[in-house]
């Protein structure tokens, strides 16, 4: 399927907005750093057919969208930047859904690798648990923001590889 040309631009804009959302210096939150165990192997892009790969990307973006549309998130970030960020994520979700639909019309393909999807869901469960334990403190949110930037960057690499495969 063809991810729209604007999709890569949306990714970059999403990362840029997430970078702008930072409210405190990451260096002041060193004590709160945490390894969330990002399932990097699920995003290496080598073993994937397109539909399952897009399905995993969709899962990642959906979970980020879920995380940043909570009440706790609204209280933590600048409202305008958060709204723009979530709008960009939603546009990406739409692009990925349309892409899978297009792929499906070409022929029945496996929609997912269940293990990959579960790995992504567990990763976000760890993030949510961390925020809960830290009582959604500003530093906890800063650590999570930096983590999401990293995971989004890695997912962008997979999306670029998918585009090159077309």
């Amino acid at each position: 399927c063809d991810l729209p040309e604007t999709h890569s631009l949306d990714n970059r804009r999403t990362l840029m907005l997430l970078a702008q959302m930072s409210r405190i210096s990451p260096s002041s939150c060193l004590m709160d750093r945490h390894d969330f165990g990002f399932p990097q192997e699920e995003f290496d892009g080598n073993q994937f057919q397109k539909a399952p790969a897009i399905s995993v990307l969709h899962e990642l973006i959906q979970q980020i969208f879920n995380l940043f549309t909570t009440k706790d998130s609204s209280a933590a970030w600048d409202e305008d930047l958060l709204d723009k960020f979530c709008t960009e994520l939603y546009q990406q979700l739409n692009d990925l859904e349309a892409c899978v639909m297009q792929e499906e019309r070409v022929g029945e393909t496996p929609l997912m690798n269940a293990d990959s999807i579960l790995a992504v869901k567990k990763y976000f469960r760890r993030i949510t648990l961390y925020l809960t334990e830290k009582k959604y403190s500003p530093c906890a949110w800063e650590v999570v923001r930096a983590e999401i930037m990293r995971s989004l960057s890695l997912s962008t690499n997979l999306q670029e590889r998918l585009r090159r495969k077309e």
């Epitope: 969709h58 899962e59 959906q62 879920n66 859904e97 349309a98 899978v100 999807i117 869901k121």
Partner: antibody
Framework: EVQLLESGAEVKRPGSSVRVSCRAS????????ISWVRQAPGQGLEWMGR????????NYAQNFRGRITITADKSPLTAYLELSSLRFEDTAVYYC???????????????????WGQGSLVTVSS | EIVLTQSPGTLSLSPGEGATLSCRAS???????LTWYQQKPGQSPRLLIY???SRATGVPDRFSGGGSGTDFTLTISRLEPEDFAVFYC???????????FGQGTKVEIK
């Protein structure tokens, strides 16, 4: 588990408008769409439209465009259906319905209705 | 726009018998976006099968879904008294998002 609770039954005159509410509780996400589906007496199910409460983005079925408005509040998570220029054939049970965040992959989640309200009967009568 | 046609309109069967319900689409639908619901009189619909063949939480394994392309089936291997109801198939298409329901098949006690 998500619970959806709709407002009570309404009797309306032809040409008037009706507003039905749907309050969500439990494991709710404003990042998943809430849809409205109606069922005329003895008839099948008909999707009317949906809203993504987190952003207020709406999508409407072709049949209802121009007469339907769906809105939502994020806290408490509540969706509203407003249908104007009511006709006798709008007499139906109106359901709100939402997907499940537990269905994997999430790309399937928004394609179906895992949770349903109890339904709100709207009767259009002169 | 996709049209879903369910057949038969009514199925009269006895408890213990098997039932096969058909849902035919006017154009190709991915099985991943084909869903089945059960609705009993006076109740809201209940999710049964999604993704063409995955059972929703709490749905007994006597219910199974299958098919691809334009022809889909819901099979109930052995009807229990609580299974008699109306069954609807539903498809999803995007963009823009459109949810389409079949007109329903009523499974009644003979």
């Amino acid at each position: 588990e998500v619970q959806l609770l709709e407002s009570g039954a309404e009797v309306k005159r032809p040409g008037s408008s009706v507003r039905v509410s749907c309050r969500a509780s439990g494991d709710t996400f404003s990042s998943y769409p809430i849809s409205w589906v109606r069922q005329a007496p003895g008839q099948g199910l008909e999707w009317m439209g949906r809203i993504l409460p987190a952003l207020g983005v709406t999508n409407y079925a072709q049949n209802f465009r121009g007469r339907i408005t769906i809105t939502a509040d994020k806290s408490p998570l509540t969706a509203y259906l407003e249908l104007s220029s009511l006709r006798f054939e709008d007499t139906a049970v109106y359901y709100c319905a939402s997907p499940s965040a537990d269905i994997i992959p999430s790309i399937l989640g928004t394609t179906l209705f895992a949770f349903w309200g109890q339904g709100s009967l709207v009767t259009v009568s002169s | 726009e996709i049209v879903l046609t369910q057949s038969p309109g009514t199925l009269s069967l006895s408890p213990g018998e098997g039932a096969t319900l058909s849902c035919r689409a006017s154009q190709n639908v991915s099985r991943h976006y084909l869903t089945w619901y059960q609705q009993k009189p006076g109740q809201s619909p209940r999710l049964l099968i999604y993704g063409g063949s995955s059972r929703a939480t709490g749905v007994p394994d006597r219910f199974s879904g299958g098919g691809s392309g334009t022809d889909f089936t819901l099979t109930i291997s052995r009807l229990e008294p609580e299974d008699f109801a109306v069954f609807y198939c539903q498809s999803y298409h995007s963009p823009p998002p459109v949810y389409t329901f079949g007109q329903g098949t009523k499974v009644e006690i003979k």
